[in-house]
C-alpha cells in the first residue's frame, strides 16, 4: 500500500499568518531545555522576526539571528526552531500547495516512493557515519549544521523540542521535501518514476550579470520559473555566528550572513539566488540530464544532496574558486544547474578588468563537474546570461542535448534558443536598475519575433521569453513538446542587486508572473483556479520592492 | 543621432489609398520597431501599428482591415498604407521608433505630415 | 483597449509656478506610462518614462510618480518654452493608447 501521510503533523487552526510574528529560543541553564518566548531576548539562542507582506507585494520577510555565545550545533538547531514558529501557518500552506500527496495516501507510484525512501535513507545514513568519522572537518561540521537547522524546524513544527546530541534522524519523506525539491526532478528520473514533474524542455529560471558602460556597475539578476503553486514566498536573512569547525578556537566562517529568496521551511534558496557577507552573489539556473546513461552516477553512498552542496559552499567559500572547489566534493548529480558565483570584492568599480574572480561559472551534472573563470568573457562582451542550457561543450554533449537539437531544433541549442537571442539582442539596453528589471521580466510573446515557435499552433509561445508565462498558451493548441503547453508555470519572481546593493545586503525584488506587457495573473480567472494555493493574493500585480531589512 | 522624415500626400479623396513613406537615418531599421502614429484635429493621438526587425507587424486592431505597413531595408525605408479613407482619416501622420520591448516608449518621432481627406 | 483620461483639458499657470498633470488608466497598468511633451509645430518628445525615471536632455524640473491607476507629471517651475500639450502614454498592452492630453497656458 501507500506510504503513510509525511510532513506537517499537526493541523493548523487558525491560517491567517500574523502580520509581524517575534521569537525567541531561550536556553533553560538548569534543565538544559530549550524553549520559545516571544520577543527578542538579549540571551536567547536564536531570534527570528517574521513580517508577513504577503498580500501587499507578495513577499513575507524573515529576519533570523543565532548567539554566538552558544556552540554552532545549538544554534543550527534553534535556527531551525524558531524559523518554524514565526512562519507555522506559512509552512503549512506551502506544503499543502505543493508537496502534501507527494508520496502520500494517494499515491498510485508505490514501487518508486519506496524506492526514493530507501535512497534518502541509505544518504541519510551514510552522511551521519561521514559526520562521524570526519568530526573535524569543516566540511562535514557544515553538512551537520545543516542537518541540524533541518531537524531543528521539524521538531519545532511539530511541538516537539528536543536538541540532539548524538546521531539524529532526518524524516527521509517529511519537511527534508521541501529541501530536495530541485533534486527530486533528478532522482525521480533516476529512479525510474513513470509521471515526472519535470516536462521536456521546462525551463527552469533566467539569469543575467550585466557589466554596465565603463564598468560603473555590475547587476545580477534572476528569474525563478516554477509552479504558480509555489508563490508563497518569503525573503530571508541570516545572521548567524558558525565556526570553521566545531572547536571554539576555528574561526567563524565567511558566509555567516545572507540574503536570499525562498520558500516557507525551506533553509536555503532552491531558485537559487543568495547575496552573502563573504562578498559574493551566487545564483543558478538549471541545466538537467538528458542522457539516460548517466543517472548510474547518482548514488546515495558517496554523495551529498545539491541542496546541501549549496549552503555548504555558501557558508565556507571566500571567492569563487573555492566556492566550486566546496561544491564539486560528493557530486550527487541530482539537481544538476549552471551556477554563477560573481565576487563583487574583485570588481572594480569604474576600472579595467581584474582579469580573474569576478566570475566563476560552474556546471553540473551527473559524474561530471566543470568550473571555469569567465571574467574576461564578461568584460568582453558586457553579460553573461544563463537560460537552462550548458555553456560548456563537454557538459553540453554529455548531458545529452546534442540528440535534442537534433530531434527539435535550435530551441535546445545554446546559441539559438529563444532566450538565448533575446537577452544577446537586448542585454545591450540595461543602463540601470529599472531596466535590468524590465529585461529579467521581459514577456512580450505576442509581439516578439523570437517568441514564435514554429512547429506550434499557435505560433506565439509564452514560454519563449525570460520570464515564462505558459498559463497565457492556448490549452488547444499544438506544440511538439511540453514545455511549450498551457501549464501553471512560468517565471515567478525577479530579483536585481548591484555592487552597492550588494554590500547592504540588499536587492530589489518583484513577486509573482510578469505583467509588464501581458495581463496579470489571477487564480479566479485563471484555468487552474482549483489547484490549491492556499496563503496566495489571487491577483498578482506586484511592482518590485526594495528589501527592508532595518 | 536617429531621424525619422515624413512623406506623402497632403490631400486624399475619399476611398482612396493613403500611402505614406517613413525615411530613417542614423539607425537601421533591421532593429527596433517601426510605428505609424496620428493625430486628429481633436489633439488625440492613435498607434496605428508597427513592422518589427524581422519584418513581421501589427496592426490597431480598429484599423485591421484597412492598413498594411511595408518596409524596405535597402532604402532604410518603411511605409504605411491605408485603404478606403474617409474624412475621419483626416490627421497629422508620424512615423515613431521603439527601440524595443525593454524600451516600450518612442523614443525618436518625424516631425509629421498632415494630411486632409476630402473631395 | 486601456483607456487613458487626462485631466485637466486646459492648465493655465504663471511663469515660476508648480503645476501638476493627471493621468489615469482604466485598469493597472504597474509603472508602464510615459508622457511627452508636444509644442506647437513640433512633433511629440519623450519627458517622463516608465512614470518616475528622467530622460537625458530633459529639464530636472520635470518629474513623473504614481502607479497602478493613478499617475502625475510635475513641473516645478514652470518656463514660458514649456507652454505645449502633455499626453501620457500606456505600455501595458497593446494597442498602446494616449491620454486626451493636457494644455497648458500661460494666465
Known amino acids: 500500500g501507500a506510504l503513510p501521510t509525511q510532513g506537517p503533523g499537526r493541523r493548523r487552526q487558525n491560517l491567517d499568518p500574523p502580520v509581524s510574528r517575534v521569537r525567541s529560543v531561550l536556553l533553560d541553564a538548569a534543565s538544559g531545555q530549550l524553549r520559545l518566548v516571544d520577543g527578542i531576548h538579549p540571551y536567547a539562542v536564536a531570534w527570528a522576526n517574521l513580517t508577513n507582506a504577503i498580500r501587499e507585494t507578495g513577499w513575507a520577510y524573515l529576519d533570523l539571528g543565532t548567539n554566538g555565545s552558544y556552540n554552532d550545533s545549538l544554534q543550527a538547531y534553534a535556527a531551525g526552531v524558531v524559523e518554524a514558529s514565526v512562519s507555522e501557518e506559512l509552512i503549512y500552506m506551502h506544503w499543502m500547495n505543493t508537496m502534501v500527496n507527494y508520496c502520500g495516501p494517494f499515491e498510485y507510484e508505490v514501487g518508486y516512493c519506496e524506492k526514493l525512501k530507501s535512497f534518502l535513507e541509505i544518504n541519510l545514513e551514510w552522511m551521519q557515519r561521514e559526520m562521524e568519522l570526519s568530526q573535524d572537518s569543516p566540511y562535514w561540521h557544515q553538512v551537520r549544521l545543516t542537518l541540524l537547522q533541518l531537524k531543528g524546524l521539524e521538531d519545532s513544527y511539530e511541538g516537539r523540542l528536543t536538541f540532539p546530541t548524538g546521531r539524529f534522524t532526518i524524516k527521509p519523506l517529511g519537511f527534508l521535501l521541501l529541501q530536495i525539491a530541485g533534486d527530486l526532478e533528478d532522482l525521480e528520473q533516476a529512479l525510474n518514476k513513470t509521471s515526472t514533474k519535470l516536462s521536456l524542455g521546462s525551463g527552469s529560471c533566467s539569469a543575467i550579470i550585466k557589466l554596465l558602460p565603463g564598468a560603473r556597475d555590475l547587476l545580477v539578476a534572476h528569474n525563478t520559473w516554477n509552479s504558480y503553486q509555489n508563490m508563497l514566498r518569503i525573503i530571508k536573512k541570516y545572521q548567524l555566528q558558525f565556526r570553521q569547525g566545531p572547536q571554539e578556537a576555528y574561526p567563524l566562517i565567511a558566509g555567516n550572513n545572507l540574503v536570499f529568496s525562498s520558500y516557507p521551511g525551506t533553509i536555503f534558496s532552491g531558485d537559487d539566488f543568495y547575496i552573502l557577507g563573504s562578498g559574493l552573489v551566487t545564483l543558478e539556473t538549471t541545466i538537467g540530464n538528458k542522457n539516460p546513461a548517466l543517472w548510474k552516477y547518482v548514488q546515495p553512498q558517496g554523495c551529498v544532496l545539491e541542496w546541501i552542496r549549496n549552503i555548504v559552499a555558501n557558508r565556507l567559500a571566500l571567492d569563487g574558486a573555492t566556492w566550486a572547489d566546496i561544491f564539486k566534493q560528493f557530486n550527487s548529480g541530482t539537481y544538476n544547474n549552471q551556477w554563477m558565483i560573481v565576487d563583487y570584492k574583485a570588481f572594480i568599480p569604474n576600472g579595467p578588468s581584474p582579469g580573474s574572480r569576478v566570475l566563476t561559472i560552474l556546471e553540473q551534472i551527473p559524474g561530471m563537474v566543470v568550473v571555469a573563470d569567465k571574467t574576461e568573457d564578461l568584460y568582453k562582451t558586457t553579460y553573461w546570461a544563463s537560460y537552462n542550457i550548458p555553456f560548456f561543450e563537454i557538459v553540453f554533449n554529455a548531458s545529452g542535448l546534442q540528440d535534442l537539437v537534433a530531434q527539435y531544433g535550435d530551441w535546445f541549442s545554446y546559441t539559438k534558443n529563444p532566450r538565448a537571442q533575446i537577452f544577446q539582442r537586448d542585454q545591450s539596453l540595461v543602463e540601470d536598475m529599472n531596466s535590468m528589471v524590465r529585461l529579467i521580466r521581459y514577456n512580450n510573446f505576442l509581439h516578439d519575433p523570437l517568441s514564435l515557435c514554429e512547429a506550434c499552433i499557435p505560433k506565439p509561445n509564452a514560454e519563449n521569453a525570460i520570464s515564462a508565462r505558459s498559463d497565457l498558451n492556448p490549452a488547444n493548441g499544438s506544440y511538439p513538446f511540453q514545455a511549450l503547453y498551457q501549464r501553471p508555470h512560468g517565471g515567478i519572481d525577479v530579483k536585481v542587486t548591484s555592487f552597492s546593493l550588494a554590500k547592504r545586503m540588499s536587492m530589489l525584488a518583484a513577486s509573482g508572473p510578469t505583467w509588464d506587457q501581458l495581463p496579470p495573473f489571477q487564480w479566479s480567472l485563471s484555468p487552474f483556479r482549483s489547484m490549491l494555493h492556499m496563503g496566495q493574493p489571487d491577483l498578482w500585480t506586484f511592482s518590485p520592492i526594495s528589501v527592508p531589512w532595518d | 543621432e536617429v531621424q525619422l522624415q515624413e512623406s506623402g500626400p497632403c490631400l486624399v479623396k475619399p476611398s482612396q489609398t493613403l500611402s505614406l513613406t517613413c525615411s530613417v537615418t542614423?539607425?537601421?531599421?533591421?532593429?527596433?520597431?517601426w510605428n505609424w502614429i496620428r493625430k486628429f484635429p481633436g489633439n488625440k493621438l492613435e498607434s496605428m501599428g508597427y513592422?518589427?526587425?524581422?519584418?513581421?507587424?501589427y496592426y490597431n486592431p480598429s484599423l485591421k482591415s484597412r492598413i498594411s505597413i511595408t518596409r524596405d531595408t535597402s532604402k532604410n525605408q518603411y511605409y504605411l498604407q491605408l485603404n478606403s479613407v474617409t474624412t475621419e482619416d483626416t490627421a497629422t501622420y508620424y512615423c515613431a521608433r521603439i527601440a524595443s520591448w525593454i524600451t516600450t516608449y518612442f523614443d525618436y518621432w518625424g516631425q509629421g505630415t498632415t494630411l486632409t481627406v476630402s473631395s | 483597449d486601456i483607456v487613458m483620461t487626462q485631466s485637466p483639458a486646459i492648465l493655465s499657470v504663471s511663469p515660476g509656478e508648480r503645476v501638476s498633470f493627471s493621468c489615469r488608466a482604466s485598469q493597472s497598468i504597474g509603472t508602464s506610462i510615459h508622457w511627452y511633451q508636444q509644442r506647437r509645430n513640433g512633433s511629440p518628445r519623450l519627458l517622463i518614462k516608465?512614470?518616475?525615471e528622467s530622460i537625458s536632455g530633459i529639464p530636472s524640473r520635470f518629474s513623473g510618480s504614481g502607479s497602478g491607476t493613478d499617475f502625475i507629471l510635475s513641473i516645478n517651475s514652470v518656463e514660458s518654452e514649456d507652454i505645449a500639450d502633455y499626453y501620457c502614454q500606456q505600455s501595458n498592452s497593446w494597442p498602446y493608447t494616449f491620454g486626451g492630453g493636457t494644455k497648458l497656458e500661460l494666465k
Open positions: 513592422i518589427s526587425y524581422s519584418g513581421s507587424t
Open positions: 516608465y512614470a518616475s
Open positions: 542614423g539607425d537601421s531599421i533591421t532593429s527596433g520597431y
